[in-house]
């Protein structure tokens, strides 16, 4: 088992909004849960976009999940990752 490296980034979207993206990379096996939480509970699936789980060329995998949020509300969101029985949460950078 190779645990993922998880990285959260933010980028400008439309006025007043930002897109936050949570990327998991260099993990094996390919089975992974990556999702956003808002206020400590699950964020509805229809407001999240997931990338495919793809090989990254080193025998490991990568994927991502993104959502659009209001600027100033970053503190309400965390990215949750679960892989091979281990899990972690990752805040949006300020």
């Amino acid at each position: 088992t190779v645990p993922p490296m998880v990285n959260v980034t933010r980028s400008e979207a439309s006025e007043g909004n930002i897109t936050v993206t949570c990327r998991a990379s260099s993990f094996y096996p390919r089975n992974i849960t990556l999702t956003w939480r808002q206020d400590g509970v699950s964020l509805s699936h229809d407001t999240q976009q997931w990338g495919d789980v793809l090989p990254d060329g080193n025998g490991t995998y990568q994927t991502w999940v993104a959502t659009r949020i209001c600027r100033g509300e970053e503190q309400r969101f965390t990215c949750y990752m679960e892989h091979s029985g281990n899990h972690s949460t990752h805040p949006v950078p300020s």
Partner: antibody
Framework: DVQLQGSGPGLVKPSQSLSLTCSVT???????YYWNWIRQFPGNKLEWM?????????NYNPSLKNRISITRDTSKNQFFLKLSSVTTEDTATYYC???DGRGAWFAYWAQGTLVTVSA | DIQMTQSPASLSASVGETVTITCRAS??????LAWYQQKQGKSPQLLVY???TLADGVPSRFSGSGSGTQYSLKINSLQPEDFGNYYC?????????FGAGTKVEIK
């Protein structure tokens, strides 16, 4: 370390409003986290009532939505529960509790405040 | 709303025994589950979150497991201080709801 302490009257008359205070020490309620009220009925059933967040937003249990208000006084680092039009069914032990944005589990609880609704 | 159904409602076991408490959700809660212990006259104390992770300071004889709608809390080698009520709570969505509880008595 953070500590929560609930307080308020132990007896409320039917049709009146129940008002409780949660005083927080060791952490500013505006910095982070979700500041909740939970009650436990005789017989031990637990019910989440709602929260006020670090930013001042609320989320309430729909079963209480027309009767509940959770507010705060940031200068005193306190948050408050007001439950209107109470009946004997609102007799319970009331807890204030905190969770963080990683997940809505309650790692910090105050001691309970028993509130009896009776004429 | 997601309803949480706990079983058994009560159990009695001897010191050293292994006991298991189960919690069933009315919908898939994707491991968004916590367990609490409550002693008489005290506030609930967090034992487990995210279905499997022990909270700080919780003895390793406690363990959580499960997925989907079915979850369990296991206490290995039951100790006298483990008596009390145990509750599950989901945090998949609002409103947050708790199970009705399991009373654990020491024989």
């Amino acid at each position: 370390d953070v500590q929560l302490q609930g307080s308020g009257p132990g007896l409320v008359k039917p049709s009146q409003s129940l008002s409780l205070t949660c005083s927080v020490t060791g952490y500013s309620i505006t910095n982070d986290y979700y500041w909740n009220w939970i009650r436990q009925f005789p017989g031990n059933k637990l019910e989440w009532m709602g929260f006020i967040s670090f930013g001042g937003s609320n989320n309430y249990n729909p079963s209480l939505k027309n009767r509940i208000s959770i507010t705060r006084d940031t200068s005193k680092n306190q948050f408050f529960l007001k439950l209107s039009s109470v009946t004997t069914e609102d007799t319970a032990t009331y807890y204030c509790a905190r969770y963080d944005g990683r997940g809505a589990w309650f790692a910090y609880w105050a001691q309970g405040t028993l509130v009896t609704v009776s004429a | 709303d997601i309803q949480m159904t706990q079983s058994p409602a009560s159990l009695s076991a001897s010191v050293g025994e292994t006991v298991t408490i189960t919690c069933r959700a009315s919908g898939n809660i994707h491991n968004y589950l916590a367990w609490y212990q409550q002693k008489q006259g005290k506030s609930p104390q967090l034992l487990v979150y995210d279905a499997i992770t022990l909270a700080d300071g919780v003895p390793s004889r406690f363990s959580g497991s499960g997925s989907g709608t079915q979850y369990s809390l296991k206490i290995n080698s039951l100790q006298p201080e483990d008596f009390g009520n145990y509750y599950c709570q989901h945090f998949w969505s609002f409103p947050l709801t708790f199970g009705a509880g399991t009373k654990v008595e020491i024989k």
